[in-house]
């Protein structure tokens, strides 16, 4: 017996006093536990456990399935064990065919032997196929065969336990190894949309997609700076062996303004964690904000083109857009398009293309846009710059020479006298009277200026030039003088266009 100190409890003694015992199939298993404080026998093999409160365990006709560990325990909790092999030539292996292995860990193929004296206890591939070259295993007759450091490539590997019994190779039932992959990277997480804009009362629903090698990845939706448990629904798929996808959908059936905030989809595995966020903004009602891309006061030269461009934010989506001029709606010459193709886009662009503008086409151009909640508009004041045009140039009955010119900006009229036959008129003549005729008229038309000089001041033959000009250009008109005796001849006006 084991040596123990006097008074110190000792483990029970089992008879026969062997660590391992072989009993032939059909024979009796008789095991005696001797201990003054005997409590029970227990039997274990694979996942089976039996108990017996008699101090002598008797199995009258041993079967292969009686192979296993018999443990006697006393009232002090001390125990002794004997392992009994029931040798049955017809059943060399006890098998538990469930076989799971965690990648990079060892796993046990549970095929304990009923006869420990057989040889070549090992693993073999099914249908004569070789095992993977790097597969290493360690046999143990009482437990089975341990596969060392399981690889992902072993998934669905079919194998048998094998042993040589009286010169013949015997195979167990087949095992299919299912490998649980190890996490070697953080989960991949993505969200259906990065931001959401909703009106109060609308449903908020966002889906997070979590991808990993197995379903044991953990995931949850969290609200930033809040511990409140959110309601989620899950859908999941296995796309092949080590490609798992889960969709976690968060829903708020009737969103409120105070639901606005950042929501995080968090996932972790044994390797690490990953997260992705989405932003929810809940507004009490829709809105439209317009931003002109050019100055709302536009100056354009006659005959040139101009594009009136606005960007605008509209939520919900814009329903009606129009450009208006003089109470007339443009049916063409404009386009409206979203600023981006992003599903969350609320920003749009509208462009009105005005081509070869005439002086008469200045005025207020208005962009109007509306959605189901609000209307908004913006006005552009377009001024068409035109070169002065001399409308009239006359000698009045009172001897005055009068020149009337129109243009935008307001033209300036200068007078020059050219003596004799000189072509260049340099001597300026001060006007007697200058008036802007339509200063109080429509604000976007041409401005008309009238200027007069006194022809009695001229004593010699010559030409008088009326020159009208502004920022765009200039135009001149001429009056010819001839003296016969003391009388002035009729003055013949003519114009000379100066581009």
């Amino acid at each position: 017996q084991p040596s123990v100190s006097p008074g110190e409890p000792s483990p029970p003694s089992i008879h026969p006093a062997k660590s391992e015992l072989i009993v032939r199939v059909g024979n009796e298993i008789r095991l005696l536990c001797i201990d003054p404080g005997f409590v029970k026998w227990t039997f274990e093999i694979l996942d089976e456990t039996n108990e017996n409160k008699q101090n002598e365990w008797i199995t009258e006709k041993a079967e292969a399935t009686n192979t296993g560990k018999y443990t006697c325990t006393n009232k002090h909790g001390l125990s002794s064990s004997i392992y009994v092999f029931v040798r049955d030539p017809a059943k060399l292996f006890l098998v538990d065919r469930s076989l799971y292995g965690k990648e990079d860990n060892d796993t046990l193929v549970r095929c304990p032997l009923t006869d420990p004296e057989v040889t070549s206890y090992s693993l073999k591939g099914c249908q004569g196929k070789p095992l993977p070259k790097d597969l290493r295993f360690v046999p143990d007759p009482k437990a089975g065969i341990t596969i060392k450091s399981v690889k992902r490539a072993y998934h669905r590997l079919c194998l048998h336990c094998s042993a040589d019994q009286e010169g013949k190779s015997v195979l167990s039932d087949k095992f299919i190894l299912k490998v649980r992959p190890a996490f070697k990277a953080v989960p991949v997480v993505s969200v259906s949309k990065a931001s959401y804009l909703l009106r109060e009362g609308e449903e908020f629903t966002v889906t997070c997609t979590i991808k990993d090698v197995s379903s044991s990845v953990y995931s949850t939706w969290k609200r930033e700076n809040s511990q409140t448990k959110l309601q989620e629904k899950y859908n999941s798929w296995h796309h092949g062996d080590f490609n798992y996808e889960r969709q976690a959908t968060l829903t708020i059936s009737s969103a409120r303004v105070n639901d606005s905030g950042v929501f995080m989809c968090y996932a972790n595995n044994t390797f690490g964690s990953a997260n992705v966020t989405t932003t929810l903004e809940v507004v009490d009602k829709g809105f439209i904000n317009i931003f002109p891309m050019i100055n709302t006061t536009v100056f354009v030269n006659d005959g040139e083109n101009v594009d009136l461009i606005v960007e605008y934010e509209a939520f919900p989506k814009p329903e009606h857009q129009q450009w208006i001029y003089m109470n007339r709606t443009f049916t063409d010459k404009w386009e409206d398009y979203p600023k981006s193709e992003n599903e969350s886009n609320i920003r749009y662009v509208s462009e009105l293309h005005l081509t070869r503008l005439k002086g008469t086409e200045g005025g207020t151009y208005t962009f109007l846009v509306s959605n189901s909640d609000v209307n908004a508009s913006i006005a552009f004041n377009v001024y068409v710059n035109t070169k002065p045009e001399i409308l009239t140039y006359d000698r009045l009955v009172n001897g005055m020479l009068q020149c009337v010119a129109a243009g935008f900006p307001e033209p300036t009229i200068d007078w020059y006298f050219c003596p004799g036959t000189e072509q260049r008129c340099s001597a300026s003549v001060l006007p007697v009277d200058v008036q802007t005729l339509n200063a109080s008229g429509p604000p976007f038309g041409k401005l008309v200026v009238q200027s007069s000089i006194d022809s009695s001041a001229f004593k010699h033959n010559g030409t008088v030039e009326c020159k009208a000009y502004n920022d765009v250009g200039k135009t001149s008109a001429y009056f010819n003088f001839a003296f016969k005796g003391n009388n002035k001849e009729q003055i013949h006006p003519h114009t000379l266009f100066t581009p």
Epitope: Q1, P2, H15, P16, A17, K18, S19, E20, L21, I22, V23, R24, N27, E28, I29, R30, L32, I58, F85, P116, E117
Partner: antibody, heavy 121, light 107 residues
Framework: EVQLVESGGGLVQPGGSLRLSCAAS????????MDWVRQAPGKGLEWVGR??????????EYAASVKGRFTISRDDSKNSLYLQMNSLKTEDTAVYYC????????????WGRGTLVTVSS | DIQMTQSPSSLSASVGDRVTITCRAS??????LNWYQQKPGKAPKLLIY???SLQSGVPSRFSGSGSGTDFTLTISSLQPEDFATYYC?????????FGGGTKVEIK
């Protein structure tokens, strides 16, 4: 060759001591439980005692007739079994056999040739 | 201790005879019974273990049977080399007691 060879026997006076040795060869000594069996001249076989292997925690068991006087020990590194006999009596006179138990049963499947111990004044 | 009683203590037989030796245990020992053969001046030799299992290398004319308390060793056809003393031994509970032996002699 698989064998057990006993040594250390001889003539000893009553009350004396003797140490028998058993050298094992040709098999894995550490795997086996080992026993001593004796046979008095012209008599039957008598089991003396045994020592378990490492798996059996080197537990020892003895026949009532020798308990407290004889001690069985083993040295796995030397593949050797020992029987220390103290307080010898004349009735301990016998041929002492070293015997091997198989791994999975209690019987004696290999025996030494024996060594004679004579206790006499 | 478990007592083992062997009978007969001796018997005379001729070559070719069928010989039966019995062994009785004082309590049930299941199949924990072994049979040995010993020739004068030699160490014993294991013949049968676990009541009925023939030890490797032992001729098949030797057989064992029984369970519980009553056991039998049978030599189906006695051969000249079989003249020896035969012992039974229980291996259930220490001390592992032997029977007194049966001497098989030439008639």
């Amino acid at each position: 060759e698989v064998q057990l060879v006993e040594s250390g026997g001889g003539l000893v006076q009553p009350g004396g001591s003797l140490r028998l040795s058993c050298a094992a060869s040709g098999f894995t000594f550490v795997d086996h439980d080992m026993d001593w069996v004796r046979q008095a001249p012209g008599k039957g076989l008598e089991w003396v005692g045994r020592t378990r292997n490492k798996l059996g925690s080197y537990t020892t068991e003895y026949a009532a007739s020798v308990k407290g006087r004889f001690t069985i020990s083993r040295d796995d590194s030397k593949n050797s079994l020992y029987l220390q006999m103290n307080s010898l009596k004349t009735e301990d006179t016998a041929v002492y056999y070293c015997a091997r138990e198989p791994k999975y049963w209690i019987d004696f499947d290999l025996w030494g040739r024996g060594t004679l111990v004579t206790v006499s004044s | 201790d478990i007592q083992m009683t062997q009978s007969p203590s001796s018997l005379s037989a001729s070559v070719g005879d069928r010989v039966t030796i019995t062994c009785r245990a004082s309590q049930s020992i299941s199949s924990y019974l072994n049979w040995y053969q010993q020739k004068p001046g030699k160490a014993p030799k294991l013949l049968i273990y676990a009541a009925s299992s023939l030890q490797s290398g032992v001729p098949s004319r030797f057989s064992g049977s029984g369970s519980g308390t009553d056991f039998t060793l049978t030599i189906s056809s006695l051969q000249p080399e079989d003249f020896a003393t035969y012992y039974c031994q229980q291996s259930y509970i220490a001390p592992y007691t032997f029977g007194g032996g049966t001497k098989v002699e030439i008639k």
